[in-house]
């Protein structure tokens, strides 16, 4: 028969910094040998070569050395491509072209995404506020992709659409920082919420500010950090927000700023004697020097690792001093589960089969749920194990033992409890007798 080349219809969604698999399968003829195979992955629009297999050999990546095939699976017709450390610039269509005796091709779309950070809220003016004053509330969320949708509402959930200005700027990696400004006239008191939505991930990040006018200023150094943990994806950069209220006439020469690990008191980064004293934490931290004079003591932590998770204390000393602790919660999305069946041939109703659901390189530990085709949870005869690799990322393997009915669908859902990200795989077993062909 004809050589059929198959790819997913839906775009493959990949988070920036993670690895993505562009699935492509073909139907090898009996007696097919890899020596006969020409496999080419290329960018659909520009025809730029991405990766190839020819003369019985993987000819390697022509795309920034970030691609790989699955050599052990090629002979079974799996021509999928692994794209490592996904970047915004990778977004687009990739063509998988297979030539043996016949030839064929299909294009798969890669949709890149990056979650927006929890918005930070600033108020201008932020002192001596009275009912009737006009204030500008700025909602800032960082390092997301694609462009965000921003919504404002009051404490009663009523949308605020007037006097809103939103700007989105892409950095050199193509990630967007979004700044949305709301101008409002204060009532007796009020809560203002900003919601930043990632349209691809359907991820909402929100923050709110409650303004109670006519607070008497204390004169103390107020150090403020987000109440909620900062969630950062492994391999990405995170900003640990910290702000203080500089007095009029404040100069950086007066500032002592110390970031340290809350539990061990290990020094992370410091600023003193009018100078950034640099990172004491694996050279992966940085301040925002241009913003310090305005009271922004935030810390940038680069290439986040699982081991970074925990509490960081921001200590500010000028004339007075103060500190606050911010929690960093590290996360990594779990891969789409792969499903295997044992035995996988000549299955009949009444047979006991073992279905294994495997999902990789996530953090923190996953929650695993099984259900049948009707959505009924399957809890009996499930064994789940999770193993951390040297980076602290977990591989999860969940095994379900079931007695086959006439036919049935078995779904496995791997949930990342921090990202509230669900990855699911399913297998449908029909007919008798039958052989199980795993999805490419």
């Amino acid at each position: 028969g004809a050589l059929e080349v198959q790819v997913p219809e839906d775009p493959v969604v990949a988070l920036v910094g993670t690895d993505a698999t562009l699935c492509c399968s073909f139907s090898p003829e009996p007696g097919f040998s890899l020596a006969q195979l020409n496999l080419i992955w290329q960018l659909t629009d520009t025809k730029q070569l991405v990766h190839s297999f020819a003369e019985g050999q993987d000819q390697g990546s022509a795309y920034a050395n970030r691609t790989a095939l699955f050599p052990d699976l090629l002979a079974q017709g799996n021509a999928s491509l692994r794209l490592q450390r996904v970047r915004v610039a990778d977004e687009g269509s990739f063509t998988c072209f297979v030539s043996i005796r016949d030839f064929g091709s299909a294009a798969v779309s890669l949709q890149v995404a990056a979650p927006y950070s929890k918005p930070s809220m600033t108020l201008e003016p932020n002192k001596d506020l009275r009912p009737g004053d006009t204030v500008t509330i700025t909602c800032s969320s960082y390092q997301g992709y694609p462009e965000a949708e921003v919504f404002w509402q009051d404490g009663q959930g009523v949308p605020l659409t007037g006097n809103v200005t939103t700007s989105q700027m892409a950095n050199e990696q193509g990630l967007f920082d979004v700044h949305s400004i709301l101008r409002v006239v204060l009532g007796a008191n009020g809560t203002y919420s900003c919601l930043v939505r990632n349209p691809v991930l359907q991820q909402d990040a929100h923050s709110s500010v409650t303004i109670t006018p006519q607070r008497s200023p204390t004169g103390a150094v107020e150090v403020q950090v987000p109440e909620d943990p900062v969630v950062a994806l492994v391999g990405t950069d995170a900003t640990l927000r910290c702000s203080f209220s500089p007095e009029p006439g404040f100069s950086l020469a007066q500032l002592n700023l110390i970031w340290q690990l809350t539990d061990t008191k290990q020094l992370v980064h410091s600023f003193t004697e009018g100078r950034d004293q640099g990172s004491a934490y694996a050279n992966r931290t940085a301040l925002f020097p241009d913003l310090l004079a305005q009271g922004n003591a935030s810390l940038r932590l680069q290439r986040v690792r699982v081991a970074d998770e925990g509490s960081f204390t921001c200590f500010v000393s000028i004339r007075d001093f103060g500190s606050a602790a911010v929690s960093l919660q590290v996360a990594a999305p779990y891969s789409k589960p792969s499903m295997t069946l044992e035995p996988n041939k000549d299955l009949r109703p009444g047979d006991t089969v073992t279905i294994t659901c495997s999902s990789y390189r996530g953090y923190p530990e996953a929650e695993v749920f099984w259900q049948d085709g009707q959505g009924v949870p399957l809890t009996g005869n499930v064994t789940t194990s999770q193993m951390a690799n040297e980076q602290g990322l977990f591989d999860v393997h969940s095994v379900l033992r079931v007695v086959l009915g006439a036919n049935g669908t078995y779904s496995c859902l791997v949930r990342n409890p921090v990202l509230q990200q669900d990855a699911h795989g399913s297998v449908t077993i029909t007919g008798q007798p039958m052989t199980f062909p795993p999805e490419a």
Epitope: A54, D102, S105
Partner: antibody
Framework: GASVVESGGGLVQPGGSLKLSCAAS????????MSWVRQTPDKRLELVAT????????YYPDSLKGRFTISRDNAKNTLYLQMSSLKSEDTAIYYC??????????WGQGTLVTVSA | DILLTQSPASLSVSVGETVTITCRAS??????LAWYHQKQGKSPQLLVY???NLADGVPSRFSGSGSGTQYSLKISSLQSEDFGSYYC??????????FGGGTKLEIK
């Protein structure tokens, strides 16, 4: 033995259309990828369209995309090339050729297409 | 698209001599290269496929060699029926699979 026979060529005015056919016999046409190749008056060979065995995938040079359409009817062992918006530079002998196993094993004798006012 | 450069464009030789025609690709085509012979007024005939394999019925005086971007067709002890034009064509990657510009072989 195996043979492919092209037909449908002739004289056509610029901007006109023409449909070429290629009848195959003596080999399992439905398992072969096929191409249309043209030879210009200066004797250069140019691949103008390619189709895989079941007709799911078609390929054209960027310069011809949108004007030429390759198709096949495996039940009739026939390959087609629909040409539209023809230009004088499309004047050539058009050959039907197999594209199986990374070789062009079977070629027809060609059909002449002349685009002229 | 991949560019194939054939050389020489033409040559005059005597019956019984040996000739070599070369085909250079603008990028690696991984031995996915065929050679054709075309006599005046006829259609091209396949001589060699996947760089080194002789097509059915082709005399052993023809031989193909090469890899990567450099390929050649050697004809030993030329016969009168060998005169005409020779073309290379690659089959690497997504079509169009381009042809070389041709080499015209004439009797001296």
């Amino acid at each position: 033995g195996a043979s492919v026979v092209e037909s449908g060529g002739g004289l056509v005015q610029p901007g006109g259309s023409l449909k070429l056919s290629c009848a195959a016999s003596g080999f399992t046409f439905s398992t072969f990828g096929m191409s249309w190749v043209r030879q210009t008056p200066d004797k250069r060979l140019e691949l103008v369209a390619t189709i895989n065995s079941d007709g799911v995938n078609t390929y054209y040079p960027d310069s011809l995309k949108g004007r030429f359409t390759i198709s096949r009817d495996n039940a009739k062992n026939t390959l087609y090339l629909q040409m539209s918006s023809l230009k004088s530079e499309d004047t050539a002998i058009y050959y039907c050729a197999s594209a199986e196993g990374r070789r062009g094993a079977y070629w027809g004798q060609g059909t002449l297409v002349t685009v002229s006012a | 698209d991949i560019l194939l450069t054939q050389s020489p464009a033409s040559l005059s030789v005597s019956v019984g001599e040996t000739v070599t025609i070369t085909c250079r690709a603008s990028e690696n085509v991984y031995s996915n290269l065929a050679w054709y012979h075309q006599k005046q007024g006829k259609s091209p005939q396949l001589l060699v496929y996947t760089a080194t394999n002789l097509a059915d019925g082709v005399p052993s005086r023809f031989s193909g060699s090469g890899s990567g971007t450099q390929y050649s067709l050697k004809i030993s002890s030329l016969q009168s029926e060998d005169f005409g034009s020779y073309y290379c064509q690659h089959f690497w990657g997504i079509p169009p699979w381009t042809f070389g510009g041709g080499t015209k072989l004439e009797i001296k």
